[in-house]
Interface confidence: medium
Amino acid sequence: EVEKTACPSGKKAREIDESLIFYKKWELEACVDAALLATQMDRVNAIPFTYEQLDVLKHKLDELYPQGYPESVIQHLGYLFLKMSPEDIRKWNVTSLETLKALLEVNKGHEMSPQVATLIDRFVKGRGQLDKDTLDTLTAFYPGYLCSLSPEELSSVPPSSIWAVRPQDLDTCDPRQLDVLYPKARLAFQNMNGSEYFVKIQSFLGGAPTEDLKALSQQNVSMDLATFMKLRTDAVLPLTVAEVQKLLGPHVEGLKAEERHRPVRDWILRQRQDDLDTLGLGLQGGIPNGYLVLDLSMQEALS
């Protein structure tokens, strides 16, 4: 046990206030009562402590709460949160969305730090699922949050939470993630009418199967090329030229510009050249006339 320096006469802190910024580190250690600090944490954020002084304050809280801080303290950590390590945060039990918001606010405008990632992980695990309010909050601070989750983690997202998702939240999602999210979105938006449904489901279509794309092609949705290019290749390949034409509507013109890129390139290779020619776009690479097309997947299923 290190011998502690005594607090100089008249310097014992009676409250957490601006006068403490003039204290040396050893004076803060000796003169600030940890329990007082814990009850007046909200004041710390309004005082321009140096990083070294904040280290002392953190040390005092660590001594007071070796098993992890209570939520009443966590909610008011403010800038002191930036001093916490992921190991510190793993000891916490954060259940209030207000606490989560308060700490995310401190880190606002910065990349998601390991501390924030650990905090979010603890919070979501504590709740058992990623509910709508939590998802709303997290995507407001970190638009890429949803796409940072594994498909396994995404499986805990209830369909009702999908209403909180904005198109930009899915920008960096890969096909495996969209495979998980799409069925949830389909369920969430099932009671909407045609055009409204398409607006909502559009961002999730990278996880849609062929039969759903075929169904959409019957609804005059006029899918834009950017959305089409994000569709699963295996879902696009079975679509006929007529179905793609209906699906894209006036945007079908854009196929020419994308004919060398997936999934358009692979889709062209599966179509009869005669059928492609009906589009009048000059798409080349289809199956020449007179050739027989064998659906090998069907053949394997029969044998």
């Epitope: 601006e18 954020n45 309004a46 005082i47 800038y79």
Partner: nanobody, 115 residues
Framework: QVQLVESGGGLVQPGGSLRLSCAAS????????MRWYRQAPGKGLEYIAG???????YYADSVKGRFTISRDNSKNTLYLQMNSLRAEDTAVYYC?????????WGQGTQVTVSS
């Protein structure tokens, strides 16, 4: 968003006085502590004085007894009355506050103490 604009700086002789003002773009009634810092040529930022919303004041030892901080909530303005000025008080003086985890600073006002 809080905009802070300092004024009142200038050239003054040693022993003279100046009064700096810091006008805020929003009501300072709800803002907690407001502060004055200064930065002398080639030096770091130095905390000079602070005043909480309840009127409690704090001063660095270097200005204690010579400078007085005050605020007028009705005018959304913070003041720094500087008396018995010395050559070492020459610096750019900045007004500062923290609100919603954002640090807000004014553009600064130059104070030069010279004979």
């Amino acid at each position: 968003q809080v905009q802070l604009v300092e004024s009142g700086g200038g050239l003054v002789q040693p022993g003279g006085s100046l009064r700096l003002s810091c006008a805020a773009s929003t009501s300072i009634f709800s803002i907690g502590t407001m502060r004055w810092y200064r930065q002398a040529p080639g030096k770091g930022l130095e905390y000079i004085a602070g005043m909480t919303s309840d009127g409690t004041t704090y001063y660095a030892d270097s200005v204690k007894g010579r400078f007085t901080i005050s605020r007028d909530n009705s005018k959304n303005t913070l003041y720094l009355q500087m008396n018995s000025l010395r050559a070492e008080d020459t610096a750019v003086y900045y007004c500062n506050t923290v609100a919603h985890f954002q640090n807000y600073w004014g553009q600064g006002t130059q104070v030069t103490v010279s004979s």
